[in-house]
Amino acid sequence: PEPPTACREKQYLINSQCCSLCQPGQKLVSDCTEFTETECLPCGESEFLDTWNRETHCHQHKYCDPNLGLRVQQKGTSETDTICTCEEGWHCTSEACESCVLHRSCSPGFGVKQIATGVSDTICEPCPVGFFSNVSSAFEKCHPWTSCETKDLVVQQAGTNKTDVVCGPQDRLRA
């Protein structure tokens, strides 16, 4: 018979034949042959593989480094990685939770809608027209643009979400 060019799900093609992939939690020791099945071995302690695979090495479980404020939220198994979270009152810097911050800051152009608490991080909102924020902050709201009119001045440079308006003297040269 013709050697296969594609294999079924949970199989892989090697040396013109279809071998079974190793199940999650196991790594490949040797490929199948005409006479033998694929040989797989369970991952060791602190290792995992989360898919049907032909990997020869298992992945190391993630380390939740207490020096970065991390602790184990869910212990890893042979089929799943460890999930880290931050110490109480601290917040993950990313979905992967690789480090912790007290709270995140709102970038220029954004103001603080709600200051962080022990359970929720800072909530930022974009500065609407007429307001600006030129700093990165975890407590400052958007500031209103300066009103040049109330100072008997005129707008020399328009404001943006990151900059205040620039006021200047009125043009005295009038016909």
Epitope: N67, L68, G69, C86, E87, W90, T93, S99, C100, V101, L102, H103, R104, S105, V135, S136, S137, A138, F139, E140
Partner: nanobody
Amino acid sequence: EVQLLESGGGLVQPGGSLRLSCAASGYTFAGYEMWWVRQAPGKGLERVSAISGSGGSTYYADSVKGRFTISRDDSKNTLYLQMNSLRAEDTAVYYCAKEPYSFDHRGQGTLVTVSS
């Protein structure tokens, strides 16, 4: 390497005052927003007060408004917290924190105990 060193804590009677200091080194202090946070025994972190990088804006938690004053001296790379009319519920370890507030940049804290 960023280092924050808090000092000024101690035992004080209710109604008394203390001034906490936070000496910063390893970075340009001026221009960075700074916070004071505290952790009471067996409780979570509470955000107490903050001051903007310019020193022009401040924030106070409702629990300390009118009693605590935050300030900074950029020439000395130091953050302060003046605490007046202290209450038993102010007992905690006080920490200062700098933007971007990473866990590994926190100080060791200074213990404030308010008791008669």
